[in-house]
């Protein structure tokens, strides 16, 4: 039956009295502007909302903006504009809320022309109280926390200083000129460009890349002829210009910049970008722009050194540089991604890996539902989802996929099923097996959010319309209920839910649409009466994660293990609770050739899992560049996916020589590489 | 400056249709209801019309109800009244009004007259 | 509909003069009431609305009070600019209604 229409969905009982005992309206003093709004700290219930009305005047425009607090997850809120002097905030700097449980908060003024510095207001007290402070600079960026020690912070200044802060704003001090882009590293680092000539703009692929570990008292150059870095997980990357012309590489250090070595990934040329989709402390996923304005490239997956490189999926979709990819971590299952392709027509395409990037296929068809006009045949098809392309494409996807770490295996997403993604209006799609199987959730496209890990979800119709109704299942989306939350339709602008899904509040924020004038709106919505007793132990199944054939005795195995996890029955109403941790039980899986990626020089054919030779690679002897080194590759094909854990069964031969001679990669090496202090 | 400039105000025959503009300026014209108000050759006041901050919502007299439709183009800033099946007892100098958060005439326009005569 | 009874049509008065408009609702209408000014040949301007609060920029000689179905709006010390038409509206309930209008001219 289709989704909702059930017998079994009666379950939830006198749930409009519950509900209503728990909606909390707060109509807020403001015209509509726009609204921003951070959550301080874990569990804390604290947020933060700024609300900023632009006046357009005929010379200039006039700024005013509110700030709000609550601590109450959203039920209630104070004004607490005075605290901060009255002062308008740029909306374009946000709320720079502190790493962790710090409770810091610094918002940036906007400050008349002429002032010879730009202005914050700091609270370490998550926002009861704030400290204004005049800066000596006027700040480019957001003011970045250091992520190990929240009283250090850094800024740009729109004189390309770089000015960082150990007392938590209070006192700044300018360690360095001429800075294009600056990132705090492991350990308080600081990484940073520098240009030597004109600007940023004009030294592109000449810059200098820094390194400061002690907050700007010394500084060691780590790269010359730079044209952008990047951190992701352990590795430090850098593309670099090449001496003789105008293409670029990608070279990786694992030791903050002490050492490098050249990643073994193509060139790109001036209008071709490379992109770090994702990484972690044990490999990384990088796009590789094809030559030409064709909108797409190709995916590798890099070893645990961040160096060899294995091709794992053609023609990617990614626009332009800065543009957009559906590229998307699902988050709720190890070793899941989900990404679009383009094809020879044009089309986009869905596709998803369950093993990191090993292999790529189809999203398999929802048993619920038909294929649609863009299938040439009725009966085959497959989801395609709809992510960043498709909102940035203007289609009707109010959002892009979802899944949370602590609601095991649920996957929300708008898409389509046939041969492509299509452009008509989308449905709701949910998978409770991390992307495996998927069901039609809901119909045509809707706001959502998880609760509970995953003991609710709630949604809300994307609609041009002021609207009054939202929709919950305590089922993972098989049926819905719906609650008129308000009388009065609003025009609905967000759904927002604590960071983490661990809450049972929700925040459904609008204006008014009124007779006399639109004013921001919020109703907050506390499930906790729904789900009236806390889960027990008989509330929980057994679940084998990645199981596709029960019979098989490596089933369930991925990155050389299998998980069960302990998740919770569909038709059990109950609360996990914002103490919830995930109950899983890791097993050593024996080694087969799904554990081994194809090493350099190597690729898989389609459907199938051995690696065989790159053509053009035949019969060469494989060298490459190590920290300056010259290395020779002996190797059958294949190397262990980085992360990946099974022992014994297949065992492929990889032997990596130091050939003792020197190479070059266009980079300082470590022995020419220069310190100054401060 | 708060602003609104009414246009499109005509001689028309009794049966004919016309449609009125207000160009709105100086203020965010989505966050405000507006309104129609006529004032006829004796001087006296007629709400006509008005229309909520996103125009889902309208409301008219019974007068006018089923003949006027009032509607808004917020990203041009232009509040408009489309008149039909018109009368000689329409009329009247037409003004826009623009709402605040308290009521609804807290800004007139100058006004643009209509005359329905054969 | 609500009949809103303004009173009086007309009345000649001297600058410096204290005056009273009144306006009678044929209901209660729980202070949804505004008050107009429409200068000679120009359009109108909200003075008063919810039978008390003065709009931003309107002189504090103005003032209105009233409850219940009876409302006032008093002009002290009366200023050259201040000979004009002025009209209440009430809003309390669709359609909105006005009164007749007072014509305030110089004695």
């Known amino acids: 039956s289709a989704p909702g229409e059930d017998e079994e969905c009666g379950r939830v009982r006198d749930f409009v009295a519950k509900l209503a005992n728990n909606t909390h309206q707060h109509v807020f003093d403001d015209l509509r502007g726009s609204v921003s709004l951070s959550w301080v700290g874990d569990s804390t219930g604290v947020i933060l909302v700024l609300t900023t009305f632009h006046v357009p005047l005929v010379i200039m425009t006039f700024g005013q903006s509110k700030l709000y607090r609550s601590e109450d997850y959203g039920k209630n809120f104070k004004d607490i504009t005075d605290l901060i002097n009255n002062t308008f905030i740029r909306t374009e700097f946000g709320m720079a809320i502190g790493p962790e449980n710090s409770g810091k908060v610094v918002l940036t003024a906007e400050v008349s022309g002429g002032s010879r510095g730009g202005r914050i207001f700091r609270s370490s007290d998550f926002a009861k109280n704030f400290v204004q402070t005049d800066l000596p600079f006027h700040p480019l960026t957001q003011m970045m926390y250091s992520p190990q020690n929240s009283d250090y912070l850094l800024a740009l200044s729109t004189e390309n200083g770089l000015w960082v802060s150990k007392n938590f704003g209070g006192k700044w001090e300018e360690i360095h000129k001429a800075v294009c882009l600056a990132k705090w590293g492991s350990d308080n680092t600081i990484f940073f460009t520098t240009y030597a000539n004109g600007s940023c703009k004009a030294d592109l692929g000449a810059l200098e890349l820094w390194r400061t570990s002690d907050l700007g008292k010394s500084f060691k150059t780590i790269g010359v002829k730079i044209y952008s870095f990047g951190l992701g997980g352990r590795f430090l990357f850098a593309s670099v210009m090449a001496d003789k012309d105008t293409t670029r590489r990608i070279h990786v250090s694992t030791d903050q910049g002490d050492t490098w070595s050249m990643a073994q990934l193509p060139s790109v040329g001036q209008e071709q970008f490379y992109s770090i989709l994702a990484a972690n402390d044990d490999m990384v996923f990088m796009h590789v722009d094809e030559p030409g304005d064709t909108g797409f490239g190709t995916i590798f997956t890099s070893d645990d050194r961040g160096i060899v490189y294995s091709k794992s999926l053609d023609r990617h979709l990614y626009t332009t540089t800065g543009g957009e990819t559906d590229f998307t971590n699902v988050t709720s299952l190890r070793g899941v991604y989900i990404t679009s392709v383009l094809s020879e027509d044009n089309s986009i395409q869905t596709m998803i890996t369950f093993d990191q990037g090993g292999r790529w296929t189809h999203l398999r068809k929802p048993e619920n539902s038909e294929c649609d006009a863009t299938a040439k045949n009725k009966n085959e098809c497959s989801l395609h989802i709809h992510a960043s392309y498709s909102i940035s494409q203007k289609l009707n996807v109010p959002m892009a996929p979802l899944s949370e770490p602590n609601a095991v295996g649920i996957v929300i997403a708008h898409g389509s099923v046939g041969d492509a993604i299509s452009v008509m209006v989308p449905d709701v799609y949910i998978s409770d097996d991390g992307g495996y199987s998927w069901t039609k959730m809901l119909e045509g496209p809707h706001y959502y959010t998880i609760l509970d890990s995953g003991g609710i979800i709630v949604a809300i119709e994307h609609s041009s319309r002021p609207i009054n109704v939202i929709k919950f299942s305590t089922d993972e989306g098989q049926c819905w209920q719906t609650y008129t939350f308000t009388r009065d339709p609003i025009y609905f602008t967000g759904l927002a839910s604590e960071p983490g899904a661990r809450s049972m509040n929700i925040s459904i924020w609008g204006f008014t649409e009124s007779f006399l004038t639109s004013q921001w709106v919020s109703y907050t919505i506390d499930f906790k009466d729904i789900l009236e007793r806390n889960c027990e132990e008989k509330d929980y199944t057994i679940w084998l994660a990645h199981s596709t054939d029960p019979e098989d005795y490596e089933d369930g195995c991925i990155l050389g293990y299998k998980e069960q996890f302990l998740r919770l029955r569909k038709s059990s109403v109950c609360q996990n609770g914002r103490d919830y941790v995930v109950t899983k039980q890791p097993s050593i899986c024996l080694c087969s050739l799904e554990d081994f990626l194809c090493d350099f020089g190597y690729y898989r054919p389609e459907n199938d899992s051995k690696c065989v030779e790159q053509p053009e690679l035949k019969g060469h002897d494989l060298e490459f560049c190590l920290y300056g080194r010259e290395e020779h590759l002996t190797t059958n094909g294949y190397r262990k996916i980085p992360g990946d854990k099974c022992q014994g069964g297949v065992n492929p031969v990889r032997e990596v020589k130091d050939l003792k001679k020197k190479c070059t990669s266009n980079f300082l090496s470590p022995e020419k590489q220069n310190s100054k202090s401060n | 400056e708060v602003q609104l400039v009414e246009s499109g105000g005509d001689l028309v025959k009794p049966g004919g249709s016309l449609k009125l503009s207000c160009a709105a300026s100086?203020?965010?014209?989505?966050?405000?209801?507006m309104s129609w108000v006529r004032q006829t050759p004796d001087k006296s006041l007629e709400w006509v019309a008005t229309i909520s901050t996103g125009g889902f919502y309208t409301s008219y007299p019974d007068s006018v109800k089923g003949r006027f439709t009032i509607s808004r183009d917020n990203a041009k800033n232009t509040l408009f009244l489309q008149m039909s099946s018109l009368k000689s007892e329409d009329t009247a100098m037409y003004y826009c009004a623009k709402s605040s958060s308290h009521w609804y005439f807290d800004v007139w326009g100058t006004g643009t007259t209509v005359t329905v005569s054969s | 509909d609500i009949l809103m009874t303004q009173s009086p049509s007309s009345m000649s008065v001297s600058l410096g003069d204290t005056v009273s408009i009144t306006c009678h609702a044929s209901q209660g209408i729980s202070s949804n009431i505004g008050w107009l000014q429409q200068k000679p040949g120009k359009s109108f301007k909200g003075l008063i609305y919810?039978?008390?609060n003065l709009e931003d920029g309107v002189p504090s000689r103005f003032s209105g009070s009233g409850s219940g179905a009876d409302y006032s709006l008093t002009i002290s010390s009366l200023e050259y600019e201040d000979f004009a038409d002025y009209y209440c509206?009430?809003?309390?309930?669709?359609?909105?209604?006005f009164g007749g209008g007072t014509k305030l001219e110089i004695k």
């Open positions: 100086g203020f965010t014209f989505n966050t405000h209801g």
């Open positions: 919810h039978g008390t």
């Open positions: 509206v009430q809003y309390a309930h669709f359609p909105y209604t």
